[in-house]
Interface confidence: medium
């Protein structure tokens, strides 16, 4: 793997759990300042595989609020605005990292957790299984 | 708001930076064990708005590898397999949290960072601006 030279100004790591337990600064640095300002928030409605968004809140998690996509239809919307069941609306899922308070209710102690979230939906050609 | 009673077994928080700086256990707990085993990995190819996946690696970030979706076409694939430019392929983006080594090259000190990633693409009806 890539070996990174250690910075001599690093915090002390005498903790017996090191490197399992690390210090994390929660002042979030947002790298999204130069992103395309074109809003994607209406795609859920304009897509041929539209979706609804549902709010999931958990005060023991950071971020505490995550929005989950649920596809509206099994099929996709065709040019006439009708659902075409020859195509499938499917969720696009992504694994994301969140922080889980551990022990529970502790304000300054967390564990990394990986969760699968549905971000939106896309329209796919179904896999047809032909029975011999 | 919701007041969570503090757990008496919480780690000490005398750090002068508290609550900005917290302890995080990097042993990831994976909550995805009960998710549908049906793989979504082939959707990028079967979608009417197909995408390519590009590997983004940064050893100063955790996770160090993130896959970014780039839509293959401006339009969407129609029933004949051709690109229909009356529709638009657009990226579905999500803000995710990552850990950034801070100071740089430190193995046990991080800062939370928010980045915008494209997870996949969806096919949308374009917004047509009529000029008077």
């Amino acid at each position: 793997g890539i070996t990174i030279p250690r910075n001599p100004g690093c915090p002390n790591s005498e903790d017996k759990n090191f490197p399992r337990t690390v210090m994390v600064n929660l002042n979030i640095h947002n790298r999204n300042t130069n992103t395309n300002p074109k809003r994607s928030s209406d795609y859920y409605n304009r897509s041929t595989s539209p979706w609804n968004l549902h709010r999931n809140e958990d005060p023991e998690r950071y971020p505490s609020v995550i929005w989950e996509a649920k596809c509206r239809h099994l099929g996709c919307i065709n040019a006439d605005g009708n659902v075409d069941y020859h195509m499938n609306s499917v969720p696009i899922q992504q694994e994301i990292l969140v922080l889980r308070r551990e022990p529970p209710h502790c304000p300054n102690s967390f564990r990394l957790e990986k969760i699968l979230v549905s971000v939106g939906c896309t329209c796919v050609t179904p896999i047809v299984h032909h029975v011999a | 708001g919701i007041t969570i009673p503090r757990n008496p077994g919480c780690p000490n928080s005398e750090d002068k930076n508290f609550p900005r700086t917290v302890m995080v256990n990097l042993n990831i707990h994976n909550r995805n064990t009960n998710t549908n085993p049906k793989r979504s990995s082939d959707y990028y190819n079967r979608s009417t708005s197909p995408w390519n996946l590009h590997r983004n690696e940064d050893p100063e970030r955790y996770p160090s590898v993130i896959w970014e979706a780039k839509c293959r076409h401006l339009g969407c694939i129609n029933a004949d397999g051709n690109v229909d430019y009356h529709m638009n392929s657009v990226p579905i983006q999500q803000e995710i949290l990552v850990l950034r080594r801070e100071p740089p090259h430190c193995p046990n000190s991080f800062r939370l960072e928010k980045i915008l990633v494209s997870v996949g693409c969806t096919c949308v009806t374009p917004i047509v601006h009529h000029v008077a």
């Epitope: 928030s41 859920y44 968004l53 549902h54 709010r55 809140e57 005060p59 505490s64 609020v65 | -």
Partner: nanobody, 125 residues
């Protein structure tokens, strides 16, 4: 969960203005899209205006466009409805609400799970 309390209602002459406020208690106000609805005596509750989580996107019913403005201040956990050129038909109880799902339209009442108790607006001619 979020609790909502409206204020700023009252009696006003036709053509006058009012600013309604909706104060939220809850640590995650910034993560709720918000809306204003109103209910006149003997009528159904109806959508008036809505605003996105960040405040950079809003929507209005046709009958209030150009007269009402929705805004929010996430630092103060408050959403506002600035009403101008008020008409007697604007008389109603005004409610603010927090949205917990998106089912395609801003005005879909079932998307709003948390409601305030309402504030009365009376416009006299």
């Amino acid at each position: 969960e979020v609790q909502l309390v409206e204020s700023g209602g009252g009696l006003v002459q036709a053509g006058g203005s009012l600013r309604l406020s909706c104060a939220a208690s809850g640590r995650t106000f910034f993560s709720y899209p918000m809306g204003w609805f109103r209910q006149a005596p003997g009528k159904e509750r109806e959508f008036v205006a809505a605003i996105s989580m960040s405040g950079d996107d809003s929507a209005y019913r046709d009958f209030v466009k150009g007269r009402f403005t929705i805004s929010r201040d996430n630092a103060r956990d408050t959403v506002y409805l600035h009403m101008t050129s008020l008409k007697p038909e604007d008389t109603a109880i005004y409610y603010c609400a927090a949205r917990t799902s998106y089912n395609g339209r801003y005005d879909y009442i079932d998307d709003y799970s948390y409601w305030g108790q309402g504030t009365q607006v009376t416009v006299s001619s």
